[in-house]
């Protein structure tokens, strides 16, 4: 049965009807509605928004919309005992205190329940000691400090600037270095673009602005107390001492006005090179401790936040498929915000809302998708991707058997320069074909396709005439679907010009200044970039749910597997003597990749030729495509990271936001020259090559003719 039998409209017209129904004005209206008050996870405000979305999705025409609740570990400041950092003199008197809150933006002075800046899941504590400046607190920054500069962070409070890597990795690195506290701050070099005013007059971060965020190292576990299983009402919960990923030292974020007061007194070693200097008028001395006149002064942290098991609420909407109701295409994005969520997440949630409305309009006119579409408004993403992960844990058996694809829908914009896409190689051709059909919103590209402006502004480093598509990392709700369950996933948003804007993320990220006005005044006054993102995300969902043959091209996986094998081989070849000594060979991996390439090519030929009117054969071929991503899952997971199970991709062990290819081999090779037992270390490299080669070969065989 072809999907056309579900409707009287042709597939091409369906897609056009769906895209034409998406309106920028609606996205703008939804964004305004979602951003007037804070929607922090675990609050009544966010629960009310969940109920509102449930009600509106029902009105839009979805078949069912349910709330799915879980009781997960969250973290909040103590309302009567605020967190702050002080400089204390030799008598213990506090001679400087950091601010307790961000000055509210104009128009929001009377809003209650704005959570003050804090590092979610920080333990309580009041450590005091000398300060050490550790740049971005990356792995390489600590290598520089400890190995080159011989600076010991043990027993020190470290101050690190936000940016480059996920803040949880910074805290983990500081802990491993022996620090007893971490201060995170936003340096203007990273969060203040030259020539732009600070909010409310522009989109830059003011000195009193602070980035909130969690500092967990969950490695995909979800709720820290129920790893692997849903945090439902009968859950067995770990004790807090056994919880996954909690930091062991106090952590607190500050803005650059307060950072200036701490950094201006720093003494000790000079910064090792210019890459350690930000834009404040301070020496960026590394320390430890303050300079001469201030050497008796210390820094003291006062952290009183508490971890609490709190109920969270996902909204799950269903649009039942007419032909293959047991095949799920999922569009999900989070609803919870740190404060107003003007960009993160509501610029994404508003787009999802409009996509649901458009699908609902088509459904009311008698149309249904071929496959079931699930829409999700996730809770507690900001606290560690908790809502999506708990739901996926609860529904893992269904998802691993029925999940076709997951499209993520967090922030629609992080700039207004060009498109940014991260996805599985299976979706490359889908994204290329779709963007060729969409109009570019960019100035100077009137009448041109989105593909053309995107390719011009963000060219692929490997293939001329094609746009850059990046690897999936983590730090967002696709993680459990892709990294744990092996469901083909993708994400798209509008981004900045990374060439001219070297700051990290967007300046007002996770601050009180991330408001509706920020978007409406400075980023996207016409909401044309939001509309384009809605067309890309919605178009991908439409094609995935409605095309007769799944729009996956397995040959693109073959291409990247070869590229990743070449890359990891070249890393290993930096140690030619050890490779020879320990008989390390990549032959099995290259052989598996070659086999995958040949089998994928033959599969693609069969895909062109088979009888699409035969529902059994059609289903068989589609299942081979659907299960290909699943075939890259190792049930045992990566070493020490059991919930990262994808053998080809994982979040970098040094930066959760970044994707790493052949992560098992990569981690085994990382810093291998410093390992105390080289024989054991190279043995692990060989084991990881074996796992990778086996997995690629096994995945290839799923594409072979079935009999």
């Amino acid at each position: 049965k072809s999907s056309n039998e579900a409707t009287n409209i042709t597939p091409k017209h369906n897609m056009k009807a769906f895209l034409d129904e998406l309106k920028a004005e609606n996205i703008k209206k939804f964004l305004y509605n979602f951003t007037q008050i804070p929607h922090l996870a675990g609050t009544e405000q966010n629960f009310q928004l969940a109920k509102q979305i449930q009600s509106q999705w029902k009105e839009f025409g979805l078949d069912s919309v349910e709330l799915a609740h879980y009781d997960v570990l969250l973290s909040y400041p103590n309302k009567t005992h605020p967190n702050y950092i002080s400089i204390i003199n030799e008598d213990g008197n506090e001679i400087f205190n950091t601010s307790l809150f961000e000055p509210p933006p104009p128009g929001y002075e009377n809003v209650s329940d704005i959570v003050p800046p804090f590092s979610a899941f920080s333990p309580q504590g009041m450590p005091e000691g000398d300060l050490v400046y550790v740049n971005y607190a990356r792995t390489e920054d600590f290598f520089k400090l400890e190995r080159d500069m011989k600076i010991n962070c043990s027993g020190k409070i470290v101050i690190a600037r936000y940016g480059k890597v996920f803040r949880g990795n910074k805290v983990k690195n500081a802990q491993l270095a022996g620090a007893k506290g971490v201060i995170l701050y936003s340096d203007p070099a990273d969060y203040f673009a030259p020539g732009v005013k600070s909010y409310p007059d522009g989109w830059n971060l003011p000195g009193g602005g602070v980035q909130r965020g969690n500092i967990l190292n969950l490695n995909g576990a979800g709720d820290p107390l129920t790893p692997g299983y849903p945090a439902n009402e009968y859950a067995y919960r770990r004790g807090i001492a056994e919880a996954v990923g909690l930091p062991s030292i106090p952590v607190h974020p500050i803005g650059y006005y307060d950072a200036q007061k701490l950094l201006e007194k720093m003494g000790g070693s000079a910064p090792p090179d210019s890459s350690w200097r930000g834009s404040l008028k301070v020496p960026y001395n590394v320390g430890p401790g303050f300079t001469g006149n201030f050497s008796t002064q210390k820094v003291k942290m006062h952290i009183h936040s508490t971890n609490e098991v709190t109920r969270i609420y996902n909204v799950i909407g269903t649009l039942r498929g007419a032909v293959e109701p047991d095949r799920y295409v999922i569009l999900g994005g989070h609803r919870d915000s740190w404060v107003f969520g003007g960009i993160d997440p509501q610029s994404g949630a508003a787009v999802v809302h409009e996509i649901v409305r458009s699908f609902g309009t088509l459904k009311k006119e008698g149309w249904r998708p071929r496959r079931t579409i699930l829409f999700a408004s996730w809770d507690a993403e900001e606290f560690g991707l908790l809502g999506s992960t708990e739901w996926a844990e609860e529904n893992s058996r269904l998802l691993q058997e029925r999940g076709v694809a997951y499209i993520n829908a967090d922030s629609s914009i992080e700039g207004n320069y060009t498109l940014r896409v991260d996805c599985t190689p299976l979706m490359y051709s889908l994204v290329h074909n779709l963007t060729k059909e969409l109009k570019s919103p960019d100035e100077g590209f009137e009448g041109k396709s989105l593909y053309e402006s995107w390719t011009k502004k963000s060219p692929s480093p490997e293939f001329s005439g094609m746009p850059r598509i990046s690897k999936l990392g983590s730090g967002n709700d696709f993680e459990v679907f892709f990294q744990r369950l092996g469901i083909a996933s993708g994400r798209a948003r509008y981004t900045k010009n990374w060439e001219t804007n070297k700051f990290s993320g967007y300046p007002l990220y996770h601050s009180v200044y991330e408001t509706y006005e920020l978007v409406e005044k400075f980023y996207d006054p016409m909401f044309k970039y939001h509309l384009t993102v809605a067309q890309v995300r919605g178009g991908m969902v439409f094609e995935l749910a409605n095309s007769i043959v799944l729009p996956f091209d397995c040959r693109d996986y073959a291409v990247v597997l070869r590229k990743y094998a070449d890359k990891i081989y070249s890393i290993s070849m930096k140690h030619p003597q050890e490779m020879k000594t320990y008989s390390v060979s990549f032959d099995s991996l290259f052989s598996a990749v070659k086999n995958f390439t040949e089998i994928a090519s033959k599969f693609s030929e069969r895909l062109q030729d088979f009888d699409k009117s035969n529902p059994i054969v059609l289903r068989m071929m589609n299942d081979q495509l659907m299960f290909l991503e699943r075939a890259f899952i190792d049930p045992l997971g990566l070493p020490d990271r059991p919930f990262y199970r994808h053998v080809i991709y994982a979040p970098s062990s040094h930066n959760k936001y970044a994707g790493e290819s052949f992560p098992g081999i990569y981690d085994a090779l990382f810093d291998i020259e410093s390992k105390v037992d080289p024989s054991k270390a190279w043995g692990e490299v060989k084991r990881q090559i074996y796992v990778a080669a086996f997995t690629v070969q096994a995945a290839a065989e799923t594409l072979s003719e079935v009999a």
Partner: antibody, heavy 121, light 107 residues
Framework: EVQLVQSGAEVKKPGASVKVSCKAS????????ISWVRQAPGQGLEWMGE????????YYNEKFRGRVTMTTDKSTSTAYMELRSLRSDDTAVYYC??????????????WGQGTTVTVSS | DIQMTQSPSSLSASVGDRVTITCRAS??????LNWLQQKPGGAIKRLIY???SLDSGVPSRFSGSRSGSDYTLTISSLQPEDFATYYC?????????FGGGTKVEIK
């Protein structure tokens, strides 16, 4: 439809105890807490405390600490407020009210019909 | 404890009149203030939460606003069913406290 149905009127002697019940329906009992508020004859409203059945946490007004105990029975979606060592000035209408269980909430949204407690020798 | 001073304690008005009731907070409570209506039989209903948000099913003639530490409940056109006692409630910090009440009577 959210409903909080309270137990009937009570007459107690000074020094005795009273236990008022509040049966909830129309919502997920463990997603909310129950606040207790009293109103003496001709007087205003006074918050006594609250209990959150999911967590079992109680928060009491200092004025009543040591004399009041709030409990819940999740199996029957019922909250209880026991006040001990009753005095004549405890004569009042006692109300239960629903409150969201979360870090920030909007306080009491739905209220019970009230239970009159008379303390008289 | 935060004191909520409500005024007037009573007022007489006619159907169709515009009525305003004010509560003053002794400390900063942000927008953490509700308005409650108590009918003569004792039944209590929340009308407004978070200073200005109307509860579902509450007529739009009721509105709430704030100016500094003063919070106002306005009934734009008094209806027969509005004759009742009105209380403000602050829930910014424990113990939660109520205003003394305003009895709205028929003139």
């Amino acid at each position: 439809e959210v409903q909080l149905v309270q137990s009937g009127a009570e007459v107690k002697k000074p020094g005795a105890s009273v236990k008022v019940s509040c049966k909830a329906s129309g919502y997920t009992f463990t997603s909310y807490g129950i606040s207790w508020v009293r109103q003496a004859p001709g007087q205003g409203l006074e918050w006594m405390g609250e209990i959150f059945p999911r967590r079992g946490n109680t928060y009491y007004n200092e004025k009543f600490r040591g004399r009041v105990t709030m409990t819940t029975d999740k199996s029957t979606s019922t909250a209880y407020m026991e006040l001990r060592s009753l005095r004549s000035d405890d004569t009042a209408v006692y109300y239960c009210a629903r409150v969201f269980d979360g870090y920030y909430n909007y306080a009491m949204d739905y209220w019970g019909q009230g239970t009159t407690v008379t303390v008289s020798s | 404890d935060i004191q909520m001073t409500q005024s007037p304690s009573s007022l007489s008005a006619s159907v169709g009149d515009r009525v305003t009731i004010t509560c003053r907070a002794s400390q900063d409570i942000g927008s953490s203030l509700n308005w409650l209506q108590q009918k003569p039989g004792g039944a209590i209903k929340r009308l407004i939460y978070a200073t200005s948000s109307l509860d579902s099913g509450v007529p739009s003639r009721f509105s709430g606003s704030r100016s500094g530490s003063d919070y106002t409940l306005t009934i734009s056109s008094l209806q027969p069913e509005d004759f009742a006692t009105y209380y403000c409630l602050q829930y910014a910090s424990s113990p939660y406290t109520f205003g003394g009440g305003t009895k709205v009577e028929i003139k």
